[in-house]
């Protein structure tokens, strides 16, 4: 906190310029008018102030706007944004995508900070939903953004926004998140033809149910092993050997290398060994020939 002292004669700042770097902290506090600073915020970025001087400028804005900065100031914060705390940002009402972009640009190349997370949260809540333009912007700056949201938050993503999602944006999503995103993607891409549809839906298939995988197996999609390994185990288990063979096409040979990993391992345990043998891959661990398979879950449901 800088002591309140009168501004020395002749030192009152008429504009925000480089001469202010020669002011001591108390002089900045005493001689820079907060309203002037607010109207000339864009100039601060061009002046090589020290951390300590920037702290004084922030303090002046805080005093001028105790309830939170107006968007006209926020848009021009530049480097000063990194000085803001999440508590400061929670007071803001950011509605313009241009403002959001300007502030994300400041943090570009860094991990998502608590400040940025708070800013995004305020912005999305203000808009009511994660629209396509916002999602485009956020995933451009932070490819992992989508996967940082809870399933509840993802439920506010409209299907139309799914067009903005790139495969790398889903790299860190877990099955619960893909369970929410997959139906939206299915809806978004429903009017595409077979091969184009598969290219778009492929990244979301970790949320696909068994019946959709069965349908895909009829379309010569040639799913790669990396995609297959990300499928829900409970969705893969009911697939027959013939369906998996059709689903993977020439990639079926890759099952051998993955036979000890889920979901392949669990799927093998559910198949008849003689069916597995038809693949000619040497997969072992299926149900021996002549054994009867009882579905106990069905039995429990009946009793």
């Amino acid at each position: 906190e800088v002591e309140k002292t009168a501004c020395p004669s002749g030192k009152k700042a008429r504009e925000i310029d480089e001469s202010l770097i020669f002011y001591k902290k108390w002089e900045l506090e005493a001689c820079v008018d907060a309203a002037l600073l607010a109207t000339q915020m864009d100039r601060v970025n061009a002046i090589p102030f020290t951390y300590e001087q920037l702290d004084v400028l922030k303090h002046k804005l805080d005093e001028l706007y105790p309830q939170g900065y107006p968007e006209s100031v926020i848009q021009h914060l530049g480097y000063l944004f990194l000085k803001m705390s999440p508590e400061d940002i929670r007071k803001w009402n950011v509605t313009s995508l241009e403002t959001l972009k300007a502030l994300l640009e400041v943090n570009k190349g860094h991990e998502m900070s608590p400040q940025v997370a708070t800013l995004i949260d305020r912005f999305v809540k203000g808009r009511g939903q994660l629209d396509k333009d916002t999602l485009d912007t956020l995933t451009a700056f932070y490819p992992g953004y989508l996967c940082s949201l809870s399933p509840e938050e993802l439920s506010s993503v409209p299907p139309s926004s799914i067009w903005a999602v790139r495969p790398q944006d889903l790299d860190t999503c877990d099955p619960r998140q893909l369970d929410v995103l997959y139906p939206k993607a299915r809806l978004a891409f429903q009017n595409m033809n077979g091969s184009e549809y598969f290219v778009k839906i492929q990244s979301f298939l970790g949320g696909a149910p068994t019946e959709d995988l069965k349908a895909l197996s009829q379309q010569n999609v040639s799913m790669d092993l990396a995609t297959f390994m990300k499928l829900r185990t409970d969705a893969v288990l009911p697939l027959t050997v013939a369906e998996v063979q059709k689903l993977l096409g020439p990639h079926v040979e890759g099952l051998k290398a993955e036979e000890r990993h889920r979901p392949v391992r669990d799927w093998i345990l559910r198949q008849r060994q003689d069916d597995l043998d038809t693949l000619g891959l040497g997969l072992q661990g299926g149900i021996p020939n002549g054994y009867l398979v009882l579905d106990l879950s069905m039995q429990e449901a009946l009793s």
Epitope: N45, A46, I47, P48, Y79
Partner: nanobody, 117 residues
């Protein structure tokens, strides 16, 4: 991406030193530079300023006529020529680079020590 200062040392009153502020990992052309100094137990103070083009310079009253700031964009370096040094010029000198309009990047150096004694 950082600024590295060099050229400090021990010098007698009335002597000269030339400090360098070199950019590592980014191009200094588009950045305005400020030189600051901090004497032991005192607040850091601004010493000199040069605009990104080099066309505008400014100095603290205490160093006017003795210090000269310049830049060589080909060498990605800004210089502070310090003449007629006084004991009160003693301190750690560091540079700050500000990116300007549409560029919020800002870089600080660790500093180089100057002792006039």
């Amino acid at each position: 991406l950082q600024l590295v200062e060099s050229g400090g040392g021990l010098v007698q009153p009335g002597g000269s030193l030339r400090l360098s502020c070199a950019a590592s990992g980014f191009t200094l052309d588009y950045y305005a530079i400020g030189w600051f100094r901090q004497a032991p137990g005192k607040e850091r103070e601004g010493v000199s300023y040069i605009s990104s083009s080099g066309g505008s310079t400014n100095y603290a009253d205490s160093v006017k006529g003795r210090f000269t700031i310049s830049r060589d964009n080909a060498k990605n370096t800004v210089y502070l020529q310090m003449n007629s040094l006084k004991p009160e010029d003693t301190g750690v000198y560091s540079c700050v680079a500000a990116g300007g309009y549409g560029n919020s990047s800002r870089y600080w150096g660790q500093g180089t020590s100057v002792t006039v004694s």
